[in-house]
């Protein structure tokens, strides 16, 4: 299965300020905030699927170190 990009460092913008482990980089405000303040992907029970129109992101395809919760502290830069 394809995986998303693993970092927010890229050619179009300077690297964001690294966040501490419990924080995630919020692109809209461009600084680190507690990850709990952002709607990070949550694992779904096996076999569960979201009905349209509320289709959730697939945690296993989100950026991050592994499957499951896969909430990436974006500037943590794995």
């Amino acid at each position: 299965m394809r995986r998303g990009p693993r970092s927010l460092r890229g050619r179009d913008a300077p690297a964001p300020t690294p966040c501490v482990p419990a924080e995630c980089f919020d692109l809209l405000v461009r600084h680190c905030v507690a990850c709990g303040l952002l709607r990070t992907p949550r694992p779904k029970p096996a076999g569960a699927s979201s009905p349209a129109p509320r289709t959730a992101l697939q945690p296993q395809e989100s950026v991050g170190a592994g499957a499951g919760e896969a909430a990436l502290p974006l500037p943590g830069l794995l």
């Epitope: 394809r2 998303g4 990009p5 970092s7 927010l8 460092r9 890229g10 050619r11 179009d12 913008a13 690297a15 964001p16 995630c24 980089f25 919020d26 692109l27 809209l28 405000v29 905030v33 709990g36 303040l37 952002l38 709607r39 990070t40 992907p41 509320r54 289709t55 959730a56 992101l57 989100s62 950026v63 909430a71 990436l72 974006l74």
Partner: antibody, heavy 118, light 111 residues
Framework: EVQLQESGPGLVKPSQTLSLTCTVS????????WNWIRQHPGKCLEYIGY???????YYNPSLKSRVTISRDTSKNQYSLKLSSVTAADTAVYYC????????????WGQGTLVTVSS | DIVLTQSPATLSLSPGERATLSCRAS??????????MNWFQQKPGQAPRLLIY???NRATGIPARFSGSGSGTDFTLTISSLEPEDFAVYYC?????????FGCGTKVEIK
């Protein structure tokens, strides 16, 4: 399972204020971004704005002078007010929320049609 | 604002055929190594449904026949073999910066 449900009058008179509420279940509006989007009949989707986890707001500059988005965290609801409406504001209004970290709107309400007419 | 232009406006195809939809942005939607381009499907009377996020990642429950590609300013949504339920309007949307903007859609209709 996150669910969003719009509610409010389906008919508003010209020059009055359109008021809609989005009730959220399955997640707290003190986390994430909570948006309003509208779609004119048979036309494109237009982004209105958001209220964030902190209560800060962003309004599309094209509508900024007429828009207010607020929230009631005790009811887990957020609201849209659009003042001085005209027939051009007739549209289906959606509330929606993007996930992190891609800010892709994966949760949507079913939409509510608001007609501006006298 | 970032303007998204979709083409063609209408695509007339038969079930089983391949659909290729294009979306071009007025400026790059890439940031931090991610393409902030998303694709939605909308059927009459329904809300948009997220199909693809970050240019190429399928959302939960979306069949493998849907795929997305592209980076920078040029993006493509491909439906490898159209099923009857795929006839709908498809929108691209950028989430690189606010105001988030949408294309005006490509209608995939039955030929």
């Amino acid at each position: 399972e996150v669910q969003l449900q719009e509610s409010g009058p389906g008919l508003v008179k010209p020059s009055q204020t359109l008021s809609l509420t989005c009730t959220v279940s399955g997640d707290s509006i003190t986390s994430g971004y909570w948006n309003w989007i509208r779609q004119h009949p048979g036309k494109c989707l237009e982004y209105i704005g958001y209220i964030s986890y902190s209560g800060s707001t962003y309004y599309n500059p094209s509508l900024k002078s007429r828009v207010t988005i607020s929230r009631d965290t005790s009811k887990n609801q957020y609201s849209l007010k659009l003042s001085s409406v005209t027939a051009a504001d007739t549209a289906v209004y959606y509330c929606a929320s993007p996930n992190y970290p891609f800010y892709a709107m994966d949760y949507w309400g079913q939409g509510t049609l608001v007609t501006v007419s006298s | 604002d970032i303007v998204l232009t979709q083409s063609p406006a209408t695509l007339s195809l038969s079930p089983g055929e391949r659909a290729t939809l294009s979306c071009r942005a007025s400026e790059s939607v890439d940031n931090y190594g991610i393409s902030f381009m998303n694709w939605f499907q909308q059927k009459p009377g329904q809300a948009p449904r997220l199909l693809i996020y970050a240019a190429s990642n399928r959302a939960t429950g979306i069949p493998a026949r849907f795929s997305g590609s592209g980076s920078g300013t040029d993006f493509t949504l491909t439906i490898s073999s159209l099923e009857p339920e795929d006839f709908a309007v498809y929108y691209c949307q950028q989430s690189k910066e606010v105001p988030w903007t949408f294309g005006c859609g490509t209608k995939v209709e039955i030929k």
